[in-house]
Every structure is written in structure tokens, then in C-alpha cells.
């Protein structure tokens, strides 16, 4: 039975040209995290594998940095980066947990972080 929950940074905004940390946290389970996939719609950004380290998709290699932790840092933001991002936690023995983050990249300097929320 899957008892865990994914806590994410929720809805966030950032300035064009700036950077943002995409972060998820798995709680309420003792399951072992074996891999985390970071995806934007149907595009893979990166994989963090507990044994192997990081695989960064070449399409993003100049703008994506691994970490902190299992998170992902997105740099040199453009308005095209606006959209949904997913952290997909592969765990043993629970299975897969998915968290969602919505990022809005703003032209102005009025970027504020949204509240944290949980996905059961």
C-alpha cells in the first residue's frame, strides 16, 4: 500500500533570465527512492538515479543543473519555460509517486513564490 505523499514547491513564479529550483519531497513512507525523473509535459529534463547519478537531457544541458539534493535548478529562464513540471519518484517497494509544479516565468520583476501544497 502506498502511504507516502509528495510535497512540492507548488505554483511558483520567476523572472525571465533568472533561475529557479524545482524541488519535491517524499514523506510519510519508509520506501527507498531508487530514481527521480524530472519532466516537462512530455519532455524529459533529467533523471537522478540513486546508483548512477544524474542523466541530463542534452536539450537542456546548458540550462539545467542537478540539485540541490534530488531537486533540479533551471537557469536562464525564458517565457517558454512557463508550464507544468513533474517529479516522478520511483520507490521500492511502494512504486511510483508523482508531484506537480507549475512555473510561471514573468517579464517583470514581480515574481513571487506560491504556497506549498501536497499531492497525496
Amino acid at each position: 500500500m502506498m502511504t507516502g505523499t509528495i510535497e512540492t514547491t507548488g505554483n511558483i513564479s520567476a523572472e525571465k533570465g533568472g533561475s529557479i529550483i524545482l524541488q519535491c519531497h517524499l514523506s510519510s513512507t519508509t520506501a527507498q527512492v531508487t530514481q527521480v525523473n524530472w519532466e516537462q509535459q512530455d519532455q524529459l529534463l533529467a533523471i537522478c538515479n540513486a546508483d548512477l547519478g544524474w542523466h541530463i537531457s542534452p536539450s537542456f544541458k546548458d540550462r539545467v543543473a542537478p540539485g540541490p539534493g534530488l531537486g533540479l535548478t533551471l537557469q536562464s529562464l525564458t517565457v517558454n519555460d512557463t508550464g507544468e513540471y513533474f517529479c516522478i519518484y520511483h520507490t521500492y517497494p511502494d512504486g511510483t509517486y508523482t508531484g506537480r509544479i507549475f512555473l510561471e516565468v514573468l517579464e517583470s520583476s514581480v515574481a513571487e513564490h506560491g504556497a506549498r501544497f501536497q499531492i497525496p
Epitope: 524529459l44 546508483d51 548512477l52 547519478g53 544524474w54 542523466h55 542534452p58 542537478p66 520511483h90
Partner: antibody, heavy 127, light 112 residues
Framework: QVQLQESGPGLVKPSETLSLTCIVS??????????WSWIRQHPGKGLEWIGY???????YYNPSLKSRVIISVDTTKNQFSLKLSSMTAADTAVYYC???????????????????WGQGPTVTVSS | EIVLTQTPLSLSVTPGQPASISCKSS???????????LSWYLQKPGLPPQVLIY???NRFSGVPDRFSGSGSGTDFTLKISRVEAEDVGVYYC?????????FGGGTKVEIK
């Protein structure tokens, strides 16, 4: 020498779920140097990659199929499996399992070529 | 996803003559680690594909030295220096630098 052998039904009814298993012999699926893939080939057509699994359970699926695909691994039986749901005639194909090499260096890893392939059963979707 | 385009679609070769197959990528397969993850496969009739070349130019164990691979960026080539009867089949290139893995459409090689 590692060998892969697929097993599963040759005929599936429309809307049903295809279940295939790939048995690994001559080596351990727990080797950290490899990823394990499923690939299919429609009749007279080219090759389409379905997805991969690592021995510890990490997966990635082709976005074109990901809503219908589950790949799992059973290290105790030295095998990995494919489930493809909501089958239609368009899913009629030869389904191959294959082993790919992983290159890991300095905290990063990369996917290399597919060096061992199963024989691939033909799966037909028909009522 | 990365699209790989192979040319020609088919090739009819006299035994002992050379053959060349091109694989062009929709985006650069620029390596992050100094290696380009482009491989070549031969699928003989009724059999699964078998790897010939990995990482652009490395011959897989047991592959005859008449097969060679080259290229960089977006343009890659498989050459057979002297085609033999056993070389008939469909040749595929595959990239694994970016997921999903993708294959070229294939080049059918037959003997004249």
C-alpha cells in the same frame, strides 16, 4: 554469454492488456552496468522504443506510449516485464526485449547501444 | 524527440563492392562526456537486430572489420568496404544520447 527470451501470448483481443516477460539467462539483471528495454516492430516497418527499466526499478517510457505502458523488474527471477493496456490492431507487432549498456562517470550517466536482443514474439491483436 | 533520417531507403550492391549508408539527426548529438551515443544495427531477415557499431565508430565484438562508422554532430555514416552475401538485411542507426531512444527508418541492402 547473456541471452534474452521473451514469453507471452501471440494473440491478444482488442481492449485487453498485453503481458510479456523477458527472462535473462547467463548473467544477472542486477548488474548496474545495463538498462533493460522493450522495443517493437510493426509488420514490415521500423523499430520503436517503448521504454527501459533499471534493475532497481527506475523507468522511463516513450511519451507516445506512456499512458498505456508499465515495465517492471523481478530481480529474484532475473526477469523484466512489459504490460501494454488498451490494445488495438495498431499494436500488432514483434515485441523485442534488449539489454543496453550504461556509461557512468563523475556522477553522471549515459545510455549506450543495445547489445543483446531477444528473438521477439509476434503479437497479433484480433478478436 | 530526435528524428533520424536514413538514406538511401534501399541499396543493391555487387559482391565485393563498397556500400555507404547515411544517418542524419534532427539535432546535434553533441556529447556531454566526449562520446556520441550513435549506434548501427543489422537486421537479417527473420531475426532480431544485431549491433554492429556503437558510439559512432566502435566495432562490436565479432563484427568484421569491413564495417566502419564515422561522423559527428548531425551527420553519420556506416560503410561496408566490400559487401558480402551475408550482409543482406536492413540497417538501422539509433541514437541514445536523448530519451526516448529513436531509430532511423532503415536501409535495405540486397545483393545484385
Amino acid at each position: 554469454q547473456v541471452q534474452l527470451q521473451e514469453s507471452g501470448p501471440g494473440l491478444v483481443k482488442p481492449s485487453e492488456t498485453l503481458s510479456l516477460t523477458c527472462i535473462v539467462s547467463g548473467g544477472s539483471i542486477r548488474s548496474g552496468d545495463y538498462y533493460w528495454s522493450w522495443i517493437r516492430q510493426h509488420p514490415g516497418k521500423g523499430l520503436e522504443w517503448i521504454g527501459y527499466i533499471y534493475y532497481s526499478g527506475g523507468t522511463y517510457y516513450n511519451p507516445s506510449l506512456k499512458s498505456r505502458v508499465i515495465i517492471s523488474v523481478d530481480t529474484t527471477k532475473n526477469q523484466f516485464s512489459l504490460k501494454l493496456s488498451s490494445m488495438t490492431a495498431a499494436d500488432t507487432a514483434v515485441y523485442y526485449c534488449a539489454r543496453g549498456s550504461i556509461a557512468a562517470r563523475s556522477g553522471y550517466f549515459y545510455f549506450s547501444g543495445l547489445d543483446v536482443w531477444g528473438q521477439g514474439p509476434t503479437v497479433t491483436v484480433s478478436s | 524527440e530526435i528524428v533520424l533520417t536514413q538514406t538511401p531507403l534501399s541499396l543493391s550492391v555487387t559482391p565485393g563492392q563498397p556500400a555507404s549508408i547515411s544517418c542524419k539527426s534532427s539535432q546535434s548529438l553533441l556529447p556531454s562526456d566526449g562520446k556520441t551515443y550513435l549506434s548501427w544495427y543489422l537486421q537479417k531477415p527473420g531475426l532480431p537486430p544485431q549491433v554492429l557499431i556503437y558510439e559512432v565508430s566502435n566495432r562490436f565484438s565479432g563484427v568484421p572489420d569491413r564495417f566502419s562508422g564515422s561522423g559527428s554532430g548531425t551527420d553519420f555514416t556506416l560503410k561496408i568496404s566490400r559487401v558480402e552475401a551475408e550482409d543482406v538485411g536492413v540497417y538501422y542507426c539509433m541514437q541514445s544520447i536523448q530519451l526516448p531512444l529513436t531509430f532511423g527508418g532503415g536501409t535495405k541492402v540486397e545483393i545484385k
